[in-house]
Interface confidence: medium
């Protein structure tokens, strides 16, 4: 299976809310030894490879935001803990999974990487990740609401406030 | 914050078998797996198996094929490791470790360890 | 198996002093490499995974290099906290195996 990006940028204006979006398809075994594992975290483009370094989002960690179930089940992360901070992720029926920050502010720009890991009965583990960067602005410069720009081409597209 | 607690020392007789006991608080018990790694007096670090306790089946270390059992009890949020046929070189400090996801297999949170002595 | 080897065994050093560590794979792990600290009588800690992320709550004097087979830990500062067993693991494949192990003592 693979993980795409829906948008490899998005800049908001202070104090909006954005829904960063990952999707993963292809072949995906439905059956109870197979369990999906989804979640998010902060980075930073390594030399080596991106999303290696996990950081936390708002002080909670991959661990603290994950998404765990079987097949394409839709799934929430614990509400509490995570809407404390103005976090929420989520994962629905079609393989997409999302992660909601809300009142954005300056600190909170920066790559952002979503990680699924399909893990088999036994032993066997397959890892995929994608990155988008969240730019964060202030000011006469910063749009009235947040702008996402796809993965694959340089068109921009407006989208809701969650 | 994420604590394993070991059962306590044992001693045993060679022939034996000794079953410790790792109790996981403070997270989600079942996304990760939890490994069994041991040190011998002395000597470095050595993975013996570990377990997801969503799925509940092991996975060995050749070496110990056949002689180690790692079982979890969800309920209890508690993970057991049972070495059988024990011999004098299985002294050693056991320790349980929790991977930080799946079978990522970095170890970010350990028991306090439980040392076991096989003497006659 | 996935065989570690970690050098130099033991190492003097004093508080200060840049302290580097090195452990080799004998086939390619790409960045699944780990790196543990452990005190007498203490379960290890881990300091590094992926082979240069560092671990929450670990100082920013420790660091991690490479991928394949060739990496490296370094302390850029001995503290004297710092004084311990540094372990390498590989986590590409079971059986997980780990170095043999580097002691860093006072000089």
């Known amino acids: 299976f693979k993980v795409a990006t829906l948008y490899s940028l998005y800049v908001c204006p202070e104090g909006q809310n954005v829904t960063l979006t990952c999707r993963f398809f292809g072949p995906v075994d439905k059956g109870h030894d197979v369990t999906f594992y989804k979640t998010w975290y902060r980075s930073s483009r390594g030399e080596v490879q991106t999303c290696s370094e996990r950081r936390p989002i708002r002080n909670l960690t991959f661990q603290d935001l994950h998404l765990h179930h079987g097949g394409h089940q839709a799934a929430n992360t614990s509400h509490d803990l995570a809407q404390r901070h103005g976090l929420e992720s989520a994962s629905d029926h079609h393989g997409n999974f999302s992660i909601t920050m809300r009142n954005l502010t300056l600190l909170d720009s920066g790559l952002y990487c979503c990680l699924v890991v399909e893990i088999r009965h036994h032993h066997s583990e397959h890892r995929v990740h994608g990155a988008m960067e969240l730019q964060v602005q202030t000011g006469k410069d910063a749009p009235s609401s947040c702008v996402a720009y796809p993965s694959s081409s340089q068109e921009s597209e407006n989208i809701t406030a969650a | 914050q994420v604590q394993l607690v070991q059962s306590g020392a044992e001693v045993k007789k060679p022939g034996s078998s000794v079953k410790v006991s790792c109790k996981a608080s403070g997270g989600t018990f079942s996304s990760y797996a939890i490994s069994w790694v041991r040190q011998a007096p002395g000597q470095g670090l050595e993975w013996m198996g570990g377990?997801?306790?969503?799925?509940?089946?092991?996975n060995y270390a050749q070496k110990f094929q056949g002689r180690v059992t790692i079982t979890a009890d969800e309920s209890t949020s508690t993970a057991y490791m049972e070495l059988s046929s024990l011999r004098s070189e299985d002294t050693a400090v056991y320790y349980c470790?929790?991977?930080?996801?799946?079978?990522?297999?970095?170890?970010?949170?350990w028991g306090q360890g439980t040392l076991v002595t096989v003497s006659s | 198996d996935i065989q570690m080897t970690q050098s130099p065994s033991s190492l003097s050093a004093s508080v200060g002093d840049r302290v580097t560590i090195t452990c080799r794979a004998s086939?390619?792990?790409?960045?699944?490499l780990n790196w543990y600290q452990q005190k007498p009588g203490k379960a290890p800690k881990l300091l590094i995974y992926?082979?240069?992320s560092l671990q929450s709550g670990v100082p920013s004097r420790f660091s991690g290099s490479g991928s394949g087979t060739d990496f490296t830990l370094t302390i850029s500062s001995l503290q004297p906290e710092d004084f311990a067993t540094y372990y390498c693991?590989?986590?590409?494949?079971?059986?997980?195996?780990f170095g043999q192990g580097t002691k860093v003592e006072i000089k």
């Open positions: 693991q590989q986590a590409r494949d079971t059986p997980i195996t």
């Open positions: 992926a082979a240069s």
């Open positions: 470790a929790r991977s930080s996801y799946g079978w990522s297999y970095e170890f970010d949170y």
């Open positions: 377990i997801i306790p969503i799925f509940g089946t092991a």
């Open positions: 086939q390619s792990i790409n960045t699944n």
